[in-house]
């Protein structure tokens, strides 16, 4: 790499050129660079059937530079490696290989998965969710008053989204049936005016005697068709509590 080495080589080599191209300390017309100026790396470049010596400030892709006392040279990375620090540590693999612990693998080891963006083997990440938030108030058509069956909902957040091979997230929403609290609706809470209100068809399996809506509960007179005796009301309340059906949303 130093001048004295260059001069010594120049005397020995019959074909040495005086005017070497950039970076060469000594060179020949046929072989190109034979030695390099300080700090430059010597590499062999194949041109057809011939190998030409070149001097580079850094080694090309697929090679890494090593400094020895007598030569700084470009050394080939392993066959499956595109960029490396040395033979032991690849930093970027060739297409179709995944980087793991400095090595290039065609498949990731057990417990790891391939990240096709970074082309690395990464730890499998499972979904993580928070604790459930409290149940929302029991509502029916957005109202929390009146003596009706409604629904209540609770939610939880996704703290960690899963990776491709990770466990899917459990439901983050849960809905169940409930009984709207038994109190008279205030004026602002009232539904549509009587003439706009339509009688709802009873749900499958529900008594033809529909649950009275808030308007009829307000009235001191009870219309016979809509009336339920106190015992039936109590009985229904118990059934509703037991029949707390969960409807879930999976992410």
């Amino acid at each position: 790499q130093n001048a004295s080495r260059g001069r010594r080589q120049r005397r020995m080599h019959p074909n040495v050129s005086q005017g070497c191209q950039g970076g060469c300390a000594t060179c020949s017309d046929y072989n190109g660079c034979l030695s390099c100026k300080p700090r430059l790396f010597f590499a062999l470049e194949r041109i057809g059937m011939k190998q030409i010596g070149v001097c580079l400030s850094s080694c090309p892709s697929g090679y890494y530079g090593t400094r020895y006392p007598d030569i700084n040279k470009c050394t080939k990375c392993k066959a499956d490696c595109d960029t490396c620090f040395n033979k032991n540590f690849c930093t970027k693999c060739k297409s179709g290989f995944y980087l793991h612990l400095g090595k290039c693998l065609d498949n990731c080891p057990e417990g790891l998965e391939a990240n096709n963006h970074t082309m690395e083997c990464v730890s499998i990440v499972h979904c993580e969710v928070s604790e459930w938030n409290p149940w929302s108030p029991c509502t029916k058509k957005g109202k929390t008053c009146g003596f009706k069956r409604g629904t209540e909902t609770r939610v939880r957040e996704i703290i960690q989204h899963p990776s491709a091979k990770g466990n899917l997230c459990p439901p983050t929403n849960e809905t169940r049936k409930c009984t709207v609290q038994r109190k008279k609706c205030q004026k602002g809470e009232r539904g549509k005016k009587g003439r706009e209100r339509k009688r709802k068809k009873p749900n499958k399996g529900e008594s033809k005697e529909a649950i009275p809506d808030s308007k009829s509960l307000e009235s001191s007179k009870e219309i016979p068709e809509q009336r339920e005796n106190k015992q039936q009301q109590k009985k229904r309340k118990v059934q509703d509590k037991q029949k707390s059906v969960s409807v879930s949303t999976v992410h």
């Epitope: 020895y68 040395n86 033979k87």
Partner: antibody
Framework: EVQLVESGGGVVQPGRSLRLSCAAS????????MAWVRQAPGKGLEWVAT????????YYRDSVKGRFTISRDNSKNTLYLQMNSLRAEDTAVYYC?????????WGQGTMVTVSS | DIQMTQSPSSLSASVGDRVTITCRAS??????LAWYQQKPGKAPKLLIY???SLIHGVPSRFSGSGSGTDFTLTISSLQPEDFATYFC?????????FGQGTKLEIK
């Protein structure tokens, strides 16, 4: 798994010789430059010698040149250090290691004590 | 030969502390610097190469910085297993040389 196991250490008188061996397994030995690094008791690390992958070139620290010879047998996956004319200051734990800019894999070391 | 000077030569610290070890080269070694950890009776273990590239499996609390002649190894929050001796090494020039070591002890 890469394994390097040194042997051949011991107590020797000044001026005498000793040959250390390092048996390699778990990697393609013939692809790697190999080195010996030593550590005197309670002291730092000191590179001793390196041999390139095919054995064609060797390098030594000045204080051991002409006395120590590094060699390898790629067919046996073994690295050697022939130490002649030993001195008290050669007393150390001798480690063999892969040498590729850094010393990536190390053996457990073998103790060499030069004492009269 | 390039001289590598580490400071301090020993250091007492507690678990959870942030610790910095420095390494100075007698001439420009660009980014050709590595750090090793050695525990008593064991061989050294490579932690960092090219100043700041962590070897796979080395915890991210270890980091390296610097260029030219001045370099540092930082452990952001000391763990019990980090108490050991640390060495820097230059590989820019033969002979490859090491710092004299920094012994990290429990306070």
């Amino acid at each position: 798994e890469v394994q390097l196991v040194e042997s051949g250490g011991g107590v020797v008188q000044p001026g005498r010789s000793l040959r250390l061996s390092c048996a390699a397994s778990g990697f393609t030995f013939s692809d790697y430059d190999m080195a010996w690094v030593r550590q005197a008791p309670g002291k730092g690390l000191e590179w001793v010698a390196t041999i390139i992958y095919d054995g064609s070139r060797t390098y030594y620290r000045d204080s051991v040149k002409g006395r120590f010879t590094i060699s390898r047998d790629n067919s046996k996956n073994t690295l050697y250090l022939q130490m002649n004319s030993l001195r008290a200051e050669d007393t150390a734990v001798y480690y063999c290691a892969t040498h590729d800019k850094t010393f990536d894999y190390w053996g457990q070391g073998t103790m060499v004590t030069v004492s009269s | 030969d390039i001289q590598m000077t580490q400071s301090p030569s020993s250091l007492s610290a507690s678990v959870g502390d942030r610790v910095t070890i420095t390494c100075r080269a007698s001439e420009d070694i660009y980014s050709d610097l590595a750090w090793y950890q050695q525990k008593p009776g064991k061989a050294p273990k490579l932690l960092i190469y090219d100043v700041n590239s962590l070897i796979h499996g080395v915890p991210s609390r270890f980091s390296g910085s610097g260029s030219g002649t001045d370099f540092t190894l930082t452990i952001s929050s000391l763990q019990p297993e980090d108490f050991a001796t640390y060495f820097c090494q230059q590989y820019d020039n033969y002979p490859n040389t090491f710092g004299q070591g920094t012994k990290l002890e429990i306070k």
